[in-house]
């Protein structure tokens, strides 16, 4: 199931790249699958927020991107996530790339990586 999530993530990143006009030489942070959840591409200076993933949810390939971006570009997400909410993790897009997740997944979500046995 997590392989499927990863594949869905890569598809969503590709669609987001097209929408945002991103390519390999674009400044900013590429979308990524971090083995827990999916992070969409972002411009330098943007903070991206994601909800804690539901471990065993089946992803719908046509779902809207389940993140919220704060910064100069708005991806048009319907969610209104906020770091004052429970179960929200953020990363900043910096000139050096993505920051570490804040808070750490383990503290915000109760787990920090998928177990290999599941």
């Amino acid at each position: 199931i997590f392989k499927k999530e990863q594949a869905m993530c890569l598809e969503k990143i590709q669609r987001a790249n097209e929408l945002m006009g991103f390519n390999d030489s674009s400044p900013g942070c590429p979308g990524m699958w971090d083995n827990i959840t999916c992070w969409k591409p972002a411009h330098v200076g943007e903070m991206v927020l994601v909800s804690c993933p539901e471990l065993f949810r089946i992803f719908n390939p046509d779902q809207v991107w389940e993140t919220e971006t704060i910064g100069e570009s708005d991806f048009g997400d319907s969610n209104s996530l906020d770091l004052s909410d429970m179960g929200v993790v953020s990363r900043n897009c910096t000139e050096d790339g993505w920051s570490e997740p804040f808070p750490h997944y383990f503290d915000a979500c109760g787990f920090d990586e998928y177990e290999s046995e599941t």
């Epitope: 004052s84 429970m86 929200v88 503290d107 920090d112 177990e115 046995e117």
Partner: antibody, heavy 123, light 107 residues
Framework: QVQLQQSGPGLVKPSQTLSLTCAIS??????????WNWIRQSPSRGLEWLGR?????????HYAVSVKSRITINPDTSKSQFSLQLNSVTPEDTAVYYC?????????????WGQGTLVTVSS | DIQMTQSPSSLSASVGDRITITCRAS??????LNWYQQKPGKAPKLLIY???NLQSGIPSRFSGSGSGTDFTLTINSLQPEDFATYFC?????????FGPGTKVDIK
């Protein structure tokens, strides 16, 4: 009924290693839904979380920065217990040390505690 | 580190009183906050987790509220066994810091 029973010396000399053990009954140190923590309490520092170990297919540890260079928390699956080692102790490490189980429901909290062990660091 | 402050540091009350203890975090912690009760010579005991959830076996006269940086623990109709010290703890950023405690004694 989860119970945590602590053991270890109450007196440690400066520069030596403080070693305590926490025996778990009614649960397992390998429980994938729990964490196993050490906390200490002193008049000068109050309650201070020191670190935790947990199993999620592999063993992991998180430590407080204030003791990270000196602390080791190890699980012992054969005895369902876990231990604390704190190296190079000074009189400032004098405190009551507690072990506790961490559980997640919306956030991590400590729902069962050991009885506490007063450790005095003195020559 | 996130600093946790509590007020008051101590209070005197009578059986049957309603008391409120406040806890403030030095930065936003959403609702990642726990409350513990400690009696002399004993380990802390969990009362409330995630700001307002009552731990199993804890009487309903205890309640918690708050989000962000400001939190409260309320004890309705104080009972003799409630005279103790109460600590808050933030549970989102390592190290998971505790407040300095509020001692509740008999007036």
């Amino acid at each position: 009924q989860v119970q945590l029973q602590q053991s270890g010396p109450g007196l440690v000399k400066p520069s030596q290693t403080l070693s305590l053990t926490c025996a778990i009954s009614g649960d397992s140190v390998s429980n994938r839904l729990a964490t196993w923590n050490w906390i200490r309490q002193s008049p000068s520092r109050g309650l201070e979380w020191l670190g935790r170990t947990y199993y999620r297919g592999k063993w992991k540890n998180h430590y407080a920065v204030s003791v990270k260079s000196r602390i080791t928390i190890n699980p012992d699956t054969s005895k369902s217990q876990f231990s604390l080692q704190l190296n190079s102790v000074t009189p400032e490490d004098t405190a009551v040390y507690y072990c506790a189980r961490g559980v997640w429901i919306g956030n991590w909290f400590l729902d069962h505690w050991g009885q506490g062990t007063l450790v005095t660091v003195s020559s | 580190d996130i600093q946790m402050t509590q007020s008051p540091s101590s209070l005197s009350a009578s059986v049957g009183d309603r008391i409120t203890i406040t806890c403030r975090a030095s930065q936003m912690i959403a609702r990642y906050l726990n409350w513990y009760q400690q009696k002399p010579g004993k380990a802390p005991k969990l009362l409330i987790y995630a700001s307002y959830n009552l731990q199993s076996g804890i009487p309903s006269r205890f309640s918690g509220s708050g989000s962000g940086t400001d939190f409260t623990l309320t004890i309705n109709s104080l009972q003799p066994e409630d005279f103790a010290t109460y600590f808050c703890q933030q549970a989102i950023i390592n190290p998971y810091t505790f407040g300095p405690g509020t001692k509740v004694d008999i007036k």
